[in-house]
């Protein structure tokens, strides 16, 4: 697993809709793979974390002044949709094929 | 200033190119305002941090399992260019009007 000492990467995060109170409107699935971005953005930032110029600059400033400026953060840079079955306002079960931005596709340093 | 207890926001970060070793190729300016995204992504995530659905989900999971899942992270969501003067391969000082992605325009929770 990606601990504090590991580099920014995508890790598993199973989300149960009951745990977050969304089971009141999402019928299915009961849970899904959301993924989580975990790990540090350490110098030098590798290409696979697709750093922006600002992230590169912030990383270099952090190296010089670690107590003043934070590291860049490992976050989702690309999200994927999931399909959900929910009840519409008429109470009719409806399938939304592309419920956008629910699952991490890629992580990066920002 | 945006400490650990404050909400995600844009704060000042003056970057001196000499400090990060970029003065070898950037002639001017000597320093610039890069800004930094600082502060926490606390529940409930406000509209001004433009949270993605995944960030909302992660925040809710963190509320339920704070030791297992991290909070969303306060990062640049929109960047602005700066203008830089540099020497081209002929040694001619050249102005790049739009050196993209160097300064934070907006911060958000991701």
């Amino acid at each position: 697993s990606a601990g504090a000492g590991s580099h920014c990467q995508k890790t598993s995060l199973r989300v149960n809709f009951e745990d977050i109170g969304w089971d009141s409107w999402i019928i299915a699935p009961k849970e899904y793979e959301a993924y989580e971005c975990k790990g540090g953005c350490f110098f030098p930032l590798a290409d696979d974390v697709t750093p922006t110029k600002h992230a590169i600059v912030q990383t270099l400033v952090h190296l010089k002044f670690p107590t003043k400026v934070g590291k860049a953060c490992c976050v989702p840079t690309k999200l994927s949709p999931i399909s959900v079955l929910y009840k519409d306002d008429m109470g009719v079960p409806t399938l939304k094929y592309h419920y956008e931005g629910m699952s991490v596709a890629e992580c990066g340093c920002r | 200033s945006a400490g650990a207890g404050s909400h995600c926001q844009k704060t000042s970060l003056r970057v001196n190119f000499e400090d990060i070793g970029w003065d070898s190729w950037i002639i001017a300016p000597k320093e610039y305002e890069a800004y930094e995204c600082k502060g926490g992504c606390f529940f409930p995530l406000a509209d001004d941090v433009t949270p993605t659905k995944h960030a909302i989900v992660q925040t809710l999971v963190h509320l339920k399992f704070p030791t297992k899942v991290g909070k969303a992270c306060c990062v640049p969501t929109k960047l602005s260019p700066i203008s830089v003067l540099y020497k081209d391969d002929m040694g001619v000082p050249t102005l790049k009007y739009h050196y993209e992605g160097m300064s934070v325009a907006e911060c958000g929770c991701r």
Epitope: - | I27, A28, P29, K30, E31, Y32, I82, S83, L85, M90, V92, P93, T94, L95, Y97
Partner: antibody
């Protein structure tokens, strides 16, 4: 190395035109703007205008706009400055200079003396 | 147009002395955090030579004794230790906007 070689001295009568050439070498001609600057005897430097050899776009000093034409021939890496309706106070050394895109004049030609006399 | 005023008109100093030349602009030459001020050296019978650009940066092959400073409207060219070969006229030039303009020049003489 970069070189700008200008055409020879000219003597012109008032009312005539003069066309000064500037042959560039040692770099890609279309890469930098070409500027023209003149200097009357014992006087300071006066910017006349600039031309982008790549597209032919020009910026002229308002003072010369009605009388000056700047052109290029990319095939022979040469810039030209033509000044019409010459007067005696146009007597000067005319320089071409390569300009960085922020307007600094980095390399200069040797100058062309244009004398306007009746 | 931006007017550049140089002072003094003439500077007469001994070898080894420090020369300070001034150039004042009628409006700020700063943009994007960059000062659009350049300095040129012109010796008799020669074309001008690119000396300093963006207020404080030396052109290629320029000796270290030449330095530039300033921002906004006030700029300075300093020759730390005058050499006989520094006898010349020095011009400032703004490249912030068209028309590019030059100062009237400062003549530096060696006593």
């Amino acid at each position: 190395q970069v070189q700008l070689v200008q055409s020879g001295a000219e003597v012109k009568k008032p009312g005539a035109s003069v066309k000064v050439s500037c042959k560039a070498s040692g770099y890609t001609f279309t890469r930098y703007w070409m500027h023209w600057v003149r200097q009357a005897p014992g006087q300071g430097l006066e910017w006349m205008g600039e031309i982008n050899p790549s597209q032919g776009g020009t910026n002229y000093n308002e003072k010369f706009k009605s009388r000056v034409t700047m052109t290029v021939d990319k095939s022979i890496s040469t810039a030209y400055m033509e000044l019409s309706r010459l007067r005696s106070d146009d007597t000067a050394v005319y320089y071409c200079a390569i300009g960085a895109n922020y307007g600094g004049l980095v390399y200069w030609g040797q100058g062309t003396l244009v004398t306007v006399s009746s | 147009e931006i007017v550049l005023t140089q002072s003094p008109a003439t500077l007469s100093l001994s070898p080894g002395e420090r020369a300070t030349l001034s150039c004042r602009a009628s409006e700020s030459l700063d943009n994007y955090g960059i000062s659009f001020m350049n300095w040129f050296q012109q010796k008799p019978g020669q074309a001008p030579r690119f000396l300093i650009y963006a207020a404080s940066n030396q052109g290629s092959g320029i000796p270290a004794r030449f330095s530039g400073s300033g921002s906004g409207t006030d700029f300075t060219l300093t020759i730390s230790s005058l050499q006989p070969e520094d006898t010349a006229v020095y011009f400032c030039q703004q490249s912030k906007e068209v028309p590019r303009t030059f100062g009237g020049g400062t003549k530096v003489e060696i006593k």
